[in-house]
C-alpha cells in the first residue's frame, strides 16, 4: 500500500485528502494542516514546513479545525436581550446562551440574538408543549375534556376537574374549560346565590 502523504504535500487538483484537517494553500499549490479547535495559525505553512498552531488566549476560541490567524472573542450572554448562559465559553466553543425562563427567541441569526416574553394563554387554554424550550412563542390550545385552566398565564397548565365523589361530595355544577367542578355536601341543598368549588 502507498504511504499516506503527510502535510505539507503537493496537490495538483487543488483538493486535500482530509478536508476537515487539511486545506489547500494556492500560493504554493500544497495541502497544509489546519489547526485543531482551540488553536489558531501562528505561522503559515510553506513547501518545507507545515502550519504552526498556537493555543487561543484566554477569553477567545476557535470551534473548528481552521486556518485562521486569530481566535474569536468570547461574548457573554446579554441579559438585556433576555439571554442567559447555559455553558461557558472555552478555547474550543463559544458561550452557549438560551432565552430566560418565560421568554422565547424572537430574533435568530445563526443563533438567538433577542428574546421576548411569552404571550399569555387565556383561561380555558394552555401552551402547547414544545420540543425545545424558548424556540417559539406560545401556541395556546384548548384544555382537553375534563380539564380546566382559570388564569391568563404563559405557563399555567390545564388541571383535571375535581371528582366530587372522591371527596364524599356530590356535583353542584359541572366543570368547564375555564372553571372547576363545584361540589356540595350531599345532605345540603345548594342555595342559588352560593358559588365556589366546594360547599360544606
Amino acid at each position: 500500500s502507498q504511504p499516506q502523504a503527510v502535510p505539507p504535500y503537493a496537490s495538483e487538483n487543488q483538493t486535500c485528502r482530509d478536508q476537515e484537517k487539511e486545506y489547500y494553500e494556492p500560493q504554493h499549490r500544497i495541502c497544509c494542516s489546519r489547526c485543531p479547535p482551540g488553536t489558531y495559525v501562528s505561522a503559515k505553512c510553506s513547501r518545507i514546513r507545515d502550519t504552526v498552531c498556537a493555543t487561543c488566549a484566554e477569553n477567545s476560541y476557535n470551534e473548528h479545525w481552521n486556518y485562521l490567524t486569530i481566535c474569536q472573542l468570547c461574548r457573554p450572554c446579554d441579559p438585556v436581550m433576555g439571554l442567559e448562559e447555559i455553558a461557558p465559553c472555552t478555547s474550543k466553543r463559544k458561550t452557549q446562551c438560551r432565552c430566560q425562563p418565560g421568554m422565547f427567541c424572537a430574533a435568530w441569526a445563526l443563533e438567538c440574538t433577542h428574546c421576548e416574553l411569552l404571550s399569555d394563554c387565556p383561561p380555558g387554554t394552555e401552551a402547547e408543549l414544545k420540543d425545545e424550550v424558548g424556540k417559539g412563542n406560545n401556541h395556546c390550545v384548548p384544555c382537553k375534556a375534563g380539564h380546566f385552566q382559570n388564569t391568563s398565564s404563559p405557563s399555567a397548565r390545564c388541571q383535571p376537574h375535581t371528582r366530587c365523589e372522591n371527596q364524599g361530595l356530590v356535583e353542584a355544577a359541572p366543570g368547564t374549560a375555564q372553571s372547576d367542578t363545584t361540589c356540595k355536601n350531599p345532605l345540603e341543598p345548594l342555595p342559588p346565590e352560593m358559588s365556589g368549588t366546594m360547599l360544606m
Epitope: P37, T55, A57, E63, A87, P88, T90, S91
Partner: antibody
Framework: EVQLVESGGGLVQPGGSLRLSCAAS????????MSWVRQAPGKGLEWVSG????????NYADSVKGRFTISRDNSKNTLYLQMNSLRAEDTAVYYC??????????????WGQGTMVTVSS | DIVMTQSPDSLAVSLGERATINCKSS????????????LTWYQQKPGQPPKLIIY???TRESGVPDRFSGSGSGTDFTLTISSLQAEDVAVYYC?????????FGQGTKVEIK
C-alpha cells in the same frame, strides 16, 4: 517531557487544614487551565476544582465549596489547593490534571501521580 | 449537574475478544455548532493515575492503540476494545466536559476471563 508532580498530602485531623501543591514542567503553564480531581479509596473519580490559565476564573464542586481554595502561581509553574475544615469524606488521592484549554471544562490530557490525603482522628 | 452512568460495572473478557463499555449522560453533550460530543474516556490501571484515551467521543489520543475506539452521540456512548490484551486490564471512566462541573461515570472494571 510534560510532567505534573503533586505534594503536600498527609494525615490530618477532622477540622484541620492542608495545602497541596502541583509543580508543572514541559509546557507553557499559563496557557492552560488546571484542575484538582480526587479519588476516595476504592471509589471513582470526582472533579474538585478548576482554575483558568490566568487564574481569573475558578470553580468548585458543591462538596468543597467554601472550604477549599484553588490558586496558581504562573511565575513558579505551580498549582495549589488550600483545604480547610477537612472532613473524613475528603480522604482521597488528590490528582492535579491539565486541561487542553485555557478553561478547565475540557478533557484532562495530563495527570500527576497523586498525593494521598487522610482525614482521621 | 450532568450525571454519567456507565454499564456494566465490571466485565470479564477472554484475551483477543471484544470488550464493550457503555456510558449514558443525563443531558445531551453534543454541541450542534461544531457537531462534536464533549465526552472523553480514561483508562486507569491499578496504582496509576487515569490516562486520556479518547476525546470528542471518538478521537483517539496520540499513542493509543487502534484497538480502542469510541462511538455514540448525544447521550449514549460506547468504548470498544476490539481485541482485549493483558495490558488493557484497568478501570475505564467516561467524563463529560459539556458543562460545569465536569462529571465522571462511576467506572467499569475490565478483567480477563
Amino acid at each position: 517531557e510534560v510532567q505534573l508532580v503533586e505534594s503536600g498530602g498527609g494525615l490530618v485531623q477532622p477540622g484541620g487544614s492542608l495545602r497541596l501543591s502541583c509543580a508543572a514542567s514541559g509546557f507553557t503553564f499559563s496557557s492552560y487551565a488546571m484542575s484538582w480531581v480526587r479519588q476516595a479509596p476504592g471509589k471513582g473519580l470526582e472533579w474538585v476544582s478548576g482554575i483558568s490559565g490566568s487564574g481569573g476564573r475558578t470553580n468548585y464542586a458543591d462538596s468543597v465549596k467554601g472550604r477549599f481554595t484553588i490558586s496558581r502561581d504562573n511565575s513558579k509553574n505551580t498549582l495549589y489547593l488550600q483545604m480547610n475544615s477537612l472532613r473524613a469524606e475528603d480522604t482521597a488521592v488528590y490528582y492535579c490534571a491539565k486541561s487542553d484549554n485555557w478553561h478547565y471544562l475540557d478533557a484532562f490530557d495530563i495527570w500527576g501521580q497523586g498525593t494521598m490525603v487522610t482525614v482521621s482522628s | 449537574d450532568i450525571v454519567m452512568t456507565q454499564s456494566p460495572d465490571s466485565l470479564a473478557v477472554s484475551l483477543g475478544e471484544r470488550a464493550t463499555i457503555n456510558c449514558k449522560s443525563s443531558q445531551n453533550v453534543l454541541y450542534s455548532s461544531n457537531n462534536k460530543n464533549y465526552l472523553t474516556w480514561y483508562q486507569q490501571k491499578p496504582g496509576q493515575p487515569p490516562k486520556l484515551i479518547i476525546y470528542w467521543a471518538s478521537t483517539r489520543e496520540s499513542g493509543v492503540p487502534d484497538r480502542f475506539s469510541g462511538s455514540g452521540s448525544g447521550t449514549d456512548f460506547t468504548l470498544t476494545i476490539s481485541s482485549l490484551q493483558a495490558e488493557d486490564v484497568a478501570v475505564y471512566y467516561c467524563q463529560q466536559y459539556f458543562n460545569t462541573p465536569p462529571t465522571f461515570g462511576q467506572g467499569t472494571k475490565v478483567e480477563i476471563k
